[in-house]
Interface confidence: medium
């Protein structure tokens, strides 16, 4: 079998809401993946599991099942959303994300995704990790062309 390639493209959108009383930030982050099937037969994308970390703490998880079938030598783009919560021990971020005096409220998140594919009864898992900037101060839709500058090569932890 030839390779199945998974490429994490980046954050497509981040929709934010706040609970002032609880000093809690809710971020719904939609990510985009490209999955390429380099084989001469179809491949099932069985599931995608994803999690998001902020400052080494998991703030959200998601799992998509029975997603799609990718034909021979074909590529599909898949969006998946991870609902995240920044609260409690990270509640100090509430001020950063909501202060009007700050123009850009970018935070560094680690996106982790694992894609499970299947063909002829054989399963294969491919994982990707990527640090990304996400704006926690407003609803944002990113152009995929922006993903280069959204990527964080040396995150400050």
């Amino acid at each position: 079998p030839r390779s199945i390639e998974v490429k994490y493209i980046g954050v497509k959108s981040a929709y934010v809401s706040y609970d002032a009383e609880k000093r809690t930030i809710y971020l719904n982050i939609t990510n985009t993946l490209n999955i390429t099937n380099n084989n001469y037969y179809s491949v099932e994308v069985e599931n995608i599991t994803a999690q998001v970390q902020f400052s080494k703490t998991v703030i959200g998880k998601a799992r998509l099942n029975n997603i799609t079938n990718i034909g021979p030598l074909d590529m599909k783009q898949i969006d998946y959303t991870v609902p995240t919560v920044i609260a409690e021990e990270m509640s100090y971020m509430y001020d950063f994300c909501t202060l009007l005096s700050i123009k850009v409220h970018n935070i560094v998140l680690m996106m982790q995704v694992t894609v499970t594919t299947a063909y002829f009864g054989h399963s294969e898992q491919i994982s990707q990790e990527r640090y990304q900037y996400v704006d926690c101060g407003r609803n944002t839709t990113y152009q995929l062309a922006q993903s280069e500058y959204l990527n964080v090569l040396q995150p400050q932890q």
């Epitope: 609902p83 021990e89 001020d95």
Partner: antibody, heavy 117, light 112 residues
């Protein structure tokens, strides 16, 4: 290392007030909640309230509204809880605990309050 | 308020064997973000409580891996694989999903 040091035991008269302190060290005091928890002798844990020292924002368990008042002093890295109109039901050990890395991650050693005539 | 329910005492266990402590919540502690906001604390005799487990199944720093935790949204179990004398105390579950935070009544681990 992260530490919470609480004030010493108090013996108070019914109807009086008492102010307990919790001095934090080893982390940025203003960035993390301080909680107060009550434990009656031989009983379980009861959450009273929490304060965000950076802004003074408080949230109280309904049961303790009017009984407990939380304050924090950033300059001394100290959180306070004042208990008013004390009765025998208020005799307990009171713990402070912070939300550093996790909720109730670090606890003070506790302050015993005894209400007695 | 979310009510956390625990048995007051565990079944007496022999040192070196495993023990299980149960906890039930009146509402699911599984948030839509996939995280279960259930915590376990141990209060040893004469001491302050200490964090053992956070977000249902994660071991807190410095806690021996003899401790583990699992559960659904409302039913949770803390397991100690090889009980040692230093494990004696009262085990509290707590929820951190909603204010006010609530603790279970505590389960006292008894040694045979």
């Amino acid at each position: 290392q992260v530490q919470l040091r609480q004030s010493g035991a108090e013996l108070v008269r019914p109807g009086a007030s008492v102010k307990l302190s919790c001095k934090a060290s080893g982390y940025t005091f203003t960035d993390y909640y301080i909680n107060w928890v009550k434990q009656r002798p031989g009983q379980g844990l009861e959450w009273i309230a929490r304060i965000y020292p950076g802004s003074g924002y408080t949230y109280y368990n309904e049961k303790f509204k009017g009984k407990a008042t939380l304050t924090a002093e950033g300059s001394s890295n100290t959180a306070y809880m004042q208990l008013s109109s004390l009765t025998s039901e208020d005799s307990a050990v009171y713990f402070c605990a912070n939300h550093y890395t996790n909720p109730f991650a670090y606890w003070g050693q506790g302050t015993l309050v005894t209400v007695s005539a | 308020d979310i009510v956390m329910t625990q048995a007051a005492f565990s079944n007496p266990v022999t040192l070196g064997t495993s023990a299980s402590i149960s906890c039930r919540s009146s509402k699911s502690l599984l948030h839509y973000n996939g995280i279960t906001y259930l915590y376990w604390y141990l209060q040893k005799p004469g001491q302050s409580p200490q964090l053992l487990i956070y977000q249902m199944s994660n071991l807190a720093s410095g806690v021996p891996d003899r401790f583990s935790s699992s559960g659904s949204g409302t039913d949770f179990t803390l397991r100690i694989s090889r009980v040692e004398a230093e494990d004696v105390g009262v085990y509290y579950c707590a929820q951190n999903l909603e204010l006010p935070y609530t603790f279970g009544g505590g389960t006292k681990l008894e040694i045979k």
